[in-house]
């Protein structure tokens, strides 16, 4: 007869959701052009937006030096406010939390106050986003 | 501390080739846009090229396009500028250049010098 | 292209104020960077988004833009101040420098 201990069983929990993207250039009303430099990603980038397959609260970190002064917002549903937008800025460098639900997609919007440029050049661009609730619901 | 480190300059032939390298150290390199400036003997300073830190960005002052080939290999912290068809009036200091924010060069090289002579 | 228009030389009195113009159509609009050379050296920014001071650069440089000119201002030019100075935009797709002003401490 075996027995088995609940400690000796660790739950199967997937791997936890986390992508890095970066992003070296932005058009000017439109988002940033974003890339995931690893192939090993759990999470996936799509017309680029970073799909929530998870509900759950997500550690976002945002950084990058910009070629103009700009206004940034990053979203993550149509018709619903950013989650965090800085207006007037040439360089980034911050942390939030926030509540994704299944289907959101994470996207930039930016702006420059200047008609001189379509595009907006990027040093040191990255969005970081790491799900803090493994084991919620997750549909894939 | 940052250093960038121009080599390749020579002295070549109207309608020969060169290849210019910069290594580069002290910050990183994969995320910045990184550049060549040139300055002719006695006269200002121009912008030559430019190229993302990803390398899939690149752009080219008219008066070289064409002719001249900008690209960078991440794993060895270098940049590249492959020069063919080169004229008389190529003849300058080239620097590579850098910096925190995209098109502020705060991080320059020593220059090396490329003279086009037959 | 986009042109930079700056004079070729300037003149100053050590220990008075240096106004170096650049002039451009609508370059307030852009941002703009300023560049000292001195003889056998690279270049060193000293002006970035038109009126910022990497660290380093003594408080005595500083910069404005609007309408159709730059202005880096010298409040009390220095012996060592004696250089080129360029300025600097990005226009479109291109950088574009401005012709350089020599400027030279009496």
């Known amino acids: 007869c075996l027995h088995f201990y609940a400690s000796q069983v660790p739950p199967q929990y997937p791997p936890i959701q986390s992508i890095r993207v970066q992003f070296t250039r932005c058009e000017n009303e439109k988002g940033c052009i974003i890339t995931s430099p690893s192939k090993d990603e759990t999470m996936k980038v799509q017309d680029n937006s970073i799909i929530i397959n998870c509900d759950g609260f997500y550690l976002i970190s945002l950084k990058g030096y910009f070629s103009e002064e700009l206004s940034l917002s990053l979203y993550y549903r149509k018709g619903r406010g950013p989650l965090f937008s800085l207006s007037k800025v040439t360089s980034v460098d911050s942390i939030g939390v926030a509540y994704l639900a299944f289907k959101d997609k994470v996207y930039f919007n930016v702006t420059t106050h200047s008609t001189s440029y379509k595009d907006i050049q990027v040093n040191g661009g990255e969005l970081i986003l790491i799900h803090q609730n493994p084991g919620g619901f997750c549909a894939y | 501390e940052v250093l960038l480190m121009e080599s390749g300059g020579d002295l070549v032939k109207p309608g020969g080739s060169l290849r210019l390298s910069c290594v580069a150290s002290?910050?990183?390199?994969?995320?910045?846009?990184m550049y060549w400036i040139r300055q002719a003997p006695g006269k200002g300073l121009q912008w030559v090229s430019q190229?993302?830190?990803?390398?899939?960005?690149?752009n080219y002052a008219d008066a070289v396009k064409g002719r001249f080939t900008i690209s960078r290999d991440n794993a060895k912290n270098t940049l590249y500028l492959q020069m063919n068809s080169l004229r008389d009036e190529d003849t300058a200091v080239f620097y590579c250049a850098s910096g925190i924010y995209p098109n502020a060069f705060g991080y320059w090289g020593q220059g090396t010098l490329v003279t086009v002579s037959s | 292209s986009y042109v930079l228009t700056q004079p070729p030389s300037k003149n100053v009195t050590l220990k008075q104020p240096a106004h170096i113009t650049c002039g451009g159509d609508?370059?307030?609009?852009?941002?703009v960077h300023w560049y000292q050379q001195k003889l056998g050296q690279a270049p060193v920014l000293i002006i970035y988004?038109?009126?910022s001071r990497p660290t380093g650069i003594p408080e005595r440089f500083s910069g404005a833009n609007s309408g159709n000119t730059a202005t880096l201002t010298i409040s009390g030019a220095l012996a060592e101040d004696e250089a080129d100075y360029y300025c600097?935009?990005?226009?479109?797709?291109?950088?574009?420098f401005g012709g350089g002003t020599h400027l030279t401490v009496l």
């Open positions: 988004y038109d009126s």
């Open positions: 190229i993302s830190g990803d390398g899939s960005f690149t």
């Open positions: 609508n370059i307030g609009s852009k941002s």
């Open positions: 002290g910050f990183t390199f994969s995320s910045n846009y």
């Open positions: 600097q935009v990005r226009d479109s797709s291109a950088n574009v």
